[in-house]
C-alpha cells in the first residue's frame, strides 16, 4: 500500500504512446456547478530569481500500466519522470542524449516532482475477481530544488518560499509529495 505500490509495480513501458487515456465519462453530478469561482491553486513558482527561465529541469514522458496486487489497469497511463540535475535552460535540452550537462560549482540542484494529478483508473483482475477502481497519483510537473551544504540529501530546499494561496487564479495541476519524507523513495522510483 502507499508508495510501496509504486516501487513494487510491474511497470510496463510502452514506447510511442504519448496521449493520456480517455478519462471515464462524467458521473451524474455536474462538477462545474460546485466549483469555487476561479477556483484552484495558483501555479507554483519555485524560483524567485529575476529570470525564471534561468534554470531548467528535464521532464520525460513515459507510458505504463499500473498494478495493484495481481490487478492491472485496463488502459496505460502517461506521466512524467523528472530526470537528472538542473542547470541553465540554454545548456539543458529537454531530451535524452543531447547537449552537455551543466555542473553547478556551488550547491547541488536536483530535478524532482513538483506537482501530482489524480487520474481515475480501472484495474482488471485475474480469476474472475471483480474489477477495482482507484485514483492514481501521477507526476504532472517537475521542479529544481537546491541542496545546500548545510542540509543532507533529504533536505531539499526551494529557491524561494510560496506566499499565501487563496482559491483564485489559474487552474493548476496538483502537487508534490514531501521532499523531506520521500526523496529517497522518489529517487528509487525514478
Amino acid at each position: 500500500q502507499g508508495w510501496q505500490a509504486f516501487k513494487n509495480d510491474a511497470t510496463e513501458i510502452i514506447p510511442e504512446l504519448g496521449e493520456y487515456p480517455e478519462p471515464p465519462p462524467e458521473l451524474e453530478n455536474n462538477k462545474t456547478m460546485n466549483r469555487a469561482e476561479n477556483g484552484g491553486r495558483p501555479p507554483h513558482h519555485p524560483f524567485e530569481t529575476k529570470d525564471v527561465s534561468e534554470y531548467s529541469c528535464r521532464e520525460l514522458h513515459f507510458t505504463r500500466y499500473v498494478t495493484d496486487g495481481p490487478c492491472r489497469s485496463a488502459k496505460p497511463v502517461t506521466e512524467l519522470v523528472c530526470s537528472g540535475q538542473c542547470g541553465p535552460a540554454r545548456l539543458l535540452p529537454n531530451a535524452i542524449g543531447r547537449g552537455k550537462w551543466w555542473r553547478p560549482s556551488g550547491p547541488d540542484f536536483r530535478c524532482i516532482p513538483d506537482r501530482y494529478r489524480a487520474q481515475r483508473v480501472q484495474l482488471l483482475c485475474p480469476g474472475g475477481e471483480a474489477p477495482r477502481a482507484r485514483k492514481v497519483r501521477l507526476v504532472a510537473s517537475c521542479k529544481c530544488k537546491r541542496l545546500t551544504r548545510f542540509h543532507n540529501q533529504s533536505e531539499l530546499k526551494d529557491f524561494g518560499t510560496e506566499a499565501a494561496r487563496p482559491q483564485k487564479g489559474r487552474k493548476p495541476r496538483p502537487r508534490a509529495r514531501s521532499a523531506k519524507a520521500n526523496q529517497a523513495e522518489l529517487e528509487n522510483a525514478y
Epitope: E26, R35, A133, K135
Partner: antibody, heavy 121, light 109 residues
Framework: EVQLVQSGAEVKKPGASVKVSCKVS????????MHWVRQAPGKGLEWMGG????????IYAQKFQGRVTMTEDTSTDTAYMELSSLRSEDTAVYYC??????????????WGQGTLVTVSS | QAVVTQEPSLTVSPGGTVTLTCGSS?????????PYWFQQKPGQAPRTLIS???DKHSWTPARFSGSLLGGKAALTLSGAQPEDEAEYYC?????????FGGGTKLTVL
C-alpha cells in the same frame, strides 16, 4: 505521518462569519487534498467541500455555495474554512480531513480534532 | 444533489456477523463511486475503515470488509466485538463532489 491541528472553539452571532484554521504537519499543505466536513450536535457528517486533485480545483457542496470559502496559506501550511452569514443551524463541529499522500489517492485518511462553532444570539 | 441512504440502526450479537449497506438515490452504487466507510465513536473524530469499495487501511481490523452488494456499497463485520459499537458512515464520490450517508448506529448486544 500527516497530523492536523485545528483552531479552538468559537461562539458567533447570527449573520457573522467564522474562520476555522487547520495546521498541517508531517507534509506540506500543497501535497495534500484538504476537505472540510461538519457535524451538527447529534447529527451525521456533512461534506462541505475540498480540493479535487483531478483538475486542481476546490469544489464546494451545493448547499454551501456562496457562503463558504476555503483558502490556504502555504507559508505556514495552514488551511482555512470561512463560513459567512451564520445561522443557528450552522452550530456544529467542523473537521478538516486530508489524504495520506500515497501512490493511490485515499481521501479523508487523517482528521483534525474538530472545532466547535456555536451560533447563538 | 444525490441522497445517500443507510440503515438508521442495526444490532449484532458479540461474535456475530452484520452487513451495513449504502445506497444512492441516483441508481446503483458502482466502483466508480469509490465508496468509503467511516467509524465514529462518541466524542471522537471519524476514522476511515474502507476506501475505494474494498481497500482496508493499516488500522482496519480484519473483521471489517467492504464490497458491492445488490447495487449498494456494503460493509460487513464478521465476529463483532463490543468495541465495534459505534456510528458508521458511508461516503460516495460523485465525480469529485462527495456525499455522506445518514449513518448507521451499530449496537453490539
Amino acid at each position: 505521518e500527516v497530523q492536523l491541528v485545528q483552531s479552538g472553539a468559537e461562539v458567533k452571532k447570527p449573520g457573522a462569519s467564522v474562520k476555522v484554521s487547520c495546521k498541517v504537519s508531517g507534509y506540506t499543505l500543497t501535497e495534500l487534498s484538504m476537505h472540510w466536513v461538519r457535524q451538527a450536535p447529534g447529527k451525521g457528517l456533512e461534506w462541505m467541500g475540498g480540493f479535487d486533485p483531478e483538475d486542481g480545483e476546490t469544489i464546494y457542496a451545493q448547499k454551501f455555495q456562496g457562503r463558504v470559502t476555503m483558502t490556504e496559506d502555504t507559508s505556514t501550511d495552514t488551511a482555512y474554512m470561512e463560513l459567512s452569514s451564520l445561522r443557528s443551524e450552522d452550530t456544529a463541529v467542523y473537521y478538516c480531513a486530508t489524504d495520506s499522500a500515497g501512490y493511490w489517492y485515499k481521501f479523508f485518511q487523517h482528521w483534525g480534532q474538530g472545532t466547535l462553532v456555536t451560533v447563538s444570539s | 444533489q444525490a441522497v445517500v441512504t443507510q440503515e438508521p440502526s442495526l444490532t449484532v450479537s458479540p461474535g456475530g456477523t452484520v452487513t451495513l449497506t449504502c445506497g444512492s438515490s441516483t441508481g446503483a452504487v458502482t466502483i466508480d463511486h469509490y465508496p468509503y466507510w467511516f467509524q465514529q465513536k462518541p466524542g471522537q473524530a471519524p476514522r476511515t475503515l474502507i476506501s475505494d469499495t474494498d481497500d482496508k487501511h493499516s488500522w482496519t481490523p480484519a473483521r471489517f470488509s467492504g464490497s458491492l452488494l445488490g447495487g449498494k456499497a456494503a460493509l460487513t463485520l464478521s465476529g463483532a466485538q463490543p468495541e465495534d459499537e459505534a456510528e458508521y458512515y458511508c461516503l460516495l464520490d460523485y465525480g469529485g463532489t462527495f456525499v455522506f450517508g445518514g449513518g448507521t448506529k451499530l449496537t453490539v448486544l
